[in-house]
């Protein structure tokens, strides 16, 4: 069963790499536990950024590995990417599936142009 | 280990409620469902509801709707179901099972149960 | 709600012999994400209910390889290949497709 999710068309990391946008999604049921998930799609080929699942009322945890970071409110889920270089330049797509109770539902968002541009070097100071 | 331990068997009277207790061991309370099951004496089984340990958010069968009430403490990793306006056909055991993410909320550990004998 | 049939009811098996048990469902418990939501569980006798096989044919941890599921969406068997005494009791088959949770009405195996 499909779900509506809306995310933040475009998004600029800020200097130190690091980005943030809400992921947002249409709860047709009663959603007690959620799994997100952010993929980047770049040059036609998709990868799993980070994944996380977690129960209503409990925190949003990634993996400790993880370069995410999030909270969630609601249905809305507030997602960190850290540790951007420009390299990572790409759309991020966020993925939500509604695990319990049943139905399952999934929604994929269209995605969250994320640009990253790296800090130009400081000038060497004679 | 994972322990579910319940409360003992109960006799109680028609029209009145009885509270059963379900307290978790062994695993972080807070991480899975509870489910409560209903089994008729040499019956088969009955899904009454579940609860979220965290926000004490449920779901319910309508079967159960508005007789069933399931709350946690999670202070002491209990959870509780209280049936009331009891009935004769209320006569059953009790389960309370945790469900288990990884085998796609399939009920993993379930209680020894506790036994309601509605009579006058 | 989704309706839950097995057969047979009682099942009286010889050691050493397989064993099959059926469960029909009245709705296709296959979701489009592939998945199919069916699960059993064994209640030996004066125990609590204990899970077998999750996801139609995944082996929960600790349950031995004798034991096996297929199915489609709607027809399911479970099959123990040489039953062993500590096998009897009564097997449910489950749905967690939709709410409200929807058990079998039970096949009770004992050994002949």
């Known amino acids: 069963k499909a779900m509506h999710v809306a995310q933040p068309a475009v998004v600029l990391a800020s200097s130190r790499g690091i980005a943030s946008f809400v992921c947002e999604y249409a709860s047709p049921g009663k959603a007690t536990e959620v799994r997100v998930t952010v993929l980047r799609q770049a040059d036609s080929q998709v990868t799993e950024v980070c994944a996380a699942t977690y129960m209503m009322g409990n925190e949003l945890t990634f993996l400790d590995d993880s370069i995410c970071t999030g909270t969630s409110s609601g249905n809305q889920v507030n997602l960190t990417i850290q540790g951007l270089r420009a390299m990572d330049t790409g759309l991020y797509i966020c993925k939500v599936e509604l695990m319990y109770p049943p139905p399952y539902y999934l929604g994929i968002g269209n995605g969250t142009q994320i640009y990253v541009i790296d800090p130009e070097p400081c000038p060497d100071s004679d | 280990q994972v322990q579910l331990v319940q409360s003992g068997a109960e006799v109680v009277k028609p029209g009145a409620s009885v509270k059963i207790s379900c307290k978790a061991s062994?695993?972080?309370?807070?991480?899975?469902?509870i489910n409560w099951v209903k089994q008729n004496p040499g019956q088969g089984l009955e899904w009454i509801g579940d609860?979220?340990?965290?926000?004490?958010?449920?779901n319910s069968n309508q079967k159960f709707e508005g007789r069933a009430t399931l709350t946690v403490d999670t202070s002491i990793s209990t959870a509780y179901m209280e049936l009331s306006r009891l009935r004769s056909d209320d006569t059953a055991v009790y389960y309370c099972?945790?469900?288990?993410?990884?085998?796609?909320?399939?009920?993993?550990?379930w209680g020894q149960g506790t036994l309601v004998t509605v009579s006058s | 709600d989704i309706v839950m049939t097995q057969s047979p009811l009682s099942l009286p098996v010889t050691p050493g012999e397989p064993a099959s048990i059926s469960c029909r469902s009245s709705?296709?418990?296959?979701?489009?994400?592939?998945?199919?939501?069916l699960y059993w569980y064994l209640q030996k006798p004066g125990q609590s209910p204990q899970l077998l096989i999750y996801?139609?044919?995944n082996l929960a941890s600790g349950v031995p390889d004798r034991f096996s599921s297929s199915g489609s969406g709607t027809d399911f068997t479970l099959k123990i290949s040489r039953v062993e005494a500590e096998d009897v009791g009564v097997y449910y088959c489950?749905?967690?497709?939709?709410?409200?949770?929807?058990f079998g009405g039970g096949t009770k195996l004992e050994i002949k």
């Open positions: 709705k296709s418990l296959l979701h489009s994400n592939g998945i199919t939501y």
């Open positions: 062994g695993y972080k309370f807070t991480d899975h469902f």
């Open positions: 099972a945790r469900l288990r993410r990884e085998y796609f909320y399939a009920m993993d550990y």
């Open positions: 489950a749905q967690n497709l939709e709410l409200p949770l929807t």
């Open positions: 996801q139609m044919s």
């Open positions: 609860i979220n340990p965290n926000n004490g958010g449920t």
